[in-house]
Interface confidence: low
């Protein structure tokens, strides 16, 4: 067990703070909830503290919860590939570029670390080149979320990892909006981290609303499990 992994044996409170600017539309989001890495479970509620969110909530899911991949359930035989927990409590910087097909892109930078007993994900998001009447700024996405695989590889040069995956957002007209994610994680501290063999995270997310919440918000339930490395066959992935 890595030193960081010991911090995730129970339920951990989570705080998410995002400041965003998409095509000049500025907004802030605060999120609170908890994570249980034993089950790879996240429960979070996000509120736009600046009024109405200028982009659809589903476009921010990866930035919020795929940001705290330290809550992913790594089976016993894969624990030596869990970079995310090994970087704790000092945490990691997570940077992403998200390309929305035939539309604009988000660039995000986050610091994910423990502040006291709470796992905090502080994010800045800058979005440019979006069409005002496109699927994103035109709010044409359905309020739901598909399952995805998130592919992880070691980045030995930077003592971190590189991650990429493609999100499929459902559009109201029945088509799909693709969002290509390119991600890089680097540890904040100087301590040793686990550099993984190639593997993936399998994610399932459910979006809902709080009937008592008047503000623009999103309620998220998510399960994430690591996979792709079989018992005693690590040499196949080297």
């Amino acid at each position: 067990m890595s030193k960081g992994e010991e911090l995730f044996t129970g339920v951990v409170p989570i705080l998410v703070e995002l400041d965003g600017d998409v095509n000049g539309h500025k907004f802030s989001v605060s999120g609170e909830g908890e994570g249980d890495a034993t089950y790879g479970k996240l429960t979070l509620k996000f509120i736009c503290t600046t009024g109405k969110l200028p982009v659809p909530w589903p476009t921010l899911v990866t930035t919020f919860s795929y940001g705290v991949q330290c809550f992913s359930r790594y089976p016993d035989h894969m624990k030596q590939h869990d970079f995310f927990k090994s970087a704790m409590p000092e945490g990691y910087v997570q940077e992403r570029t998200i390309f929305f097909k035939d539309d604009g892109n988000y660039k995000t930078r986050a610091e994910v670390k423990f502040e006291g007993d709470t796992l905090v994900n502080r994010i800045e998001l800058k979005g440019i080149d979006f069409k005002e009447d496109g699927n994103i700024l035109g709010h044409k996405l359905e309020y739901n979320y598909n399952s995805h695989n998130v592919y992880i590889m070691a980045d030995k040069q930077k003592n971190g990892i590189k991650v990429n995956f493609k999100i499929r957002h459902n559009i109201e007209d029945g088509s799909v909006q693709l969002a290509d994610h390119y991600q890089q994680n680097t540890p904040i501290g100087d301590g040793p981290v686990l550099l993984p063999d190639n593997h993936y995270l399998s994610t399932q997310s459910a979006l809902s609303k709080d009937p008592n919440e008047k503000r623009d918000h999103m309620v998220l339930l998510e399960f994430v499990t690591a996979a792709g490395i079989t018992h005693g066959m690590d040499e196949l992935y080297k």
């Epitope: 703070e17 400041d19 600017d21 000049g24 500025k26 907004f27 802030s28 503290t49 600046t50 930078r109 610091e111 502080r122 800045e124 800058k126």
Partner: nanobody, 121 residues
Framework: ESGGGSVQAGGSLRLSCAAS????????MAWFRQVPGKEREGVAA????????YYADSVKGRFTISQDNAKNTVYLQMNSLEPEDTSIYYC???????????????????WGQGTQVTVSS
């Protein structure tokens, strides 16, 4: 803005930014600086709501940002000034909470006219 001027290396200056038509007790107030021909660089910011402060690495321990809500004014106390601090200093305001690191100038909605600070060796 006011309080700029010329000073010897190692000296101090205090910049003031009195906001009119904008309430400093909400959102974020920041100081930026710009050398002609270069991008504006974030120096310090203060979250008006809770007083949380943020500093660029180059000024940590030397500069202090503070606010006086009653006077609707934000200050930048600059100690141990170095020739590299020579620049035009701008005060900026955003109706949103401060980003946790000093993000690009596009974050801010309101800007002052700028005040020149010159530090000679």
């Amino acid at each position: 803005e006011s309080g700029g001027g010329s000073v010897q290396a190692g000296g101090s200056l205090r910049l003031s930014c009195a906001a009119s038509g904008y309430t400093v007790s909400r959102g974020c107030m920041a100081w930026f600086r710009q050398v002609p021909g270069k991008e504006r660089e974030g120096v310090a910011a203060i979250n008006s709501g809770d007083g949380t402060t943020y500093y660029a690495d180059s000024v940590k321990g030397r500069f202090t940002i503070s606010q006086d809500n009653a006077k609707n004014t934000v200050y930048l106390q600059m100690n141990s000034l170095e020739p590299e601090d020579t620049s035009i200093y701008y005060c900026a305001a955003s109706r949103l909470r401060c980003p946790w690191n000093l993000v690009s100038a596009s974050w801010y909605d309101f800007w002052g006219q700028g005040t020149q600070v010159t530090v000679s060796s």
